[in-house]
């Protein structure tokens, strides 16, 4: 019964699966990009190290009305242990340059692919 219960109500998604799905979504965004992504909106670039997922969400959550990245925003929130609101930046987030969302997505995708290859799923 316990096992069946597990099947009936899916448990947490394994980190490797969640990361793969995020990578797939970012690939989808970059490949399907026709017009400039999010009208060329600019967001704060991030340091792709500690706290990367929360920092990425802190940057992207400020962009509203861009359906192309809404799924990415939701997926990133699953990687970030705390709630992130628009206009909120942690001490880890150094605001030194803004880049277009399209470039942000490309940079994030390259880094996540590297993490996946190295088996770093968290």
């Amino acid at each position: 019964l316990t096992c069946l219960g597990g099947f009936a109500s899916p448990g947490p998604v394994p980190p490797s699966t969640a990361l793969r799905e995020l990578i797939e979504e970012l690939v989808n965004i970059t490949q399907n990009q026709k017009a400039p992504l999010c009208n060329g909106s600019m967001v704060w670039s991030i340091n792709l190290t500690a706290g990367m997922y929360c920092a990425a969400l802190e940057s992207l959550i400020n962009v509203s009305g861009c359906s192309a990245i809404e799924k990415t925003q939701r997926m990133l929130s699953g990687f970030c242990p705390h709630k992130v609101s628009a206009g909120q930046f942690s001490s880890l987030h150094v605001r030194d340059t803004k880049i277009e969302v399209a470039q942000f997505v490309k940079d994030l995708l390259l880094h996540l692919k590297k993490l996946f290859r190295e088996g770093q799923f968290n």
């Epitope: 400039p36 999010c38 909106s41 600019m42």
Partner: nanobody, 116 residues
């Protein structure tokens, strides 16, 4: 409808100064972060500077740090960019932008040409 109207550009010699202005309407200006973005001939868009809603938080691209100053007057719904020690590489069309909305609401921009 959001409207942004830039002005103040022109031809200036290297080492000279200009002050750009941007008149904003159609939204509650004092509630939003604002950006200056530029586009040099034949190049992509480049972020220049940002300012927080209250005006106390300011940020600059390394290429303009120490030379440009961003400011705002929320009572006049106006954004400014004071540009000093201008260089040939600062030649571009300058746009003001409501942060995170992209060029959907950009104005026509104002051309800054730095040349002797």
């Amino acid at each position: 409808e959001v409207q942004l109207l830039e002005s103040g550009g022109g031809l200036v010699q290297p080492g000279g100064s200009l002050r750009l202005s941007c008149a904003a309407s159609g939204f509650t200006f004092r509630d939003y972060e604002m950006d200056w973005v530029r586009q040099a001939p034949g190049k992509g868009r480049e972020w220049v500077s940002s300012i927080g809603p209250g005006g106390s938080e300011t940020y600059y691209a390394d290429s303009v740090k120490g030379r440009f100053t961003i400011s705002r007057d929320n009572s006049k719904n106006t954004l400014y960019l004071q540009m000093n020690s201008l260089r040939a590489e600062d030649t571009a069309v300058y746009y003001c932008a409501k942060a995170y909305t992209g060029f959907k609401y950009w104005g026509q921009g104002t051309l800054v040409t730095v040349s002797s």
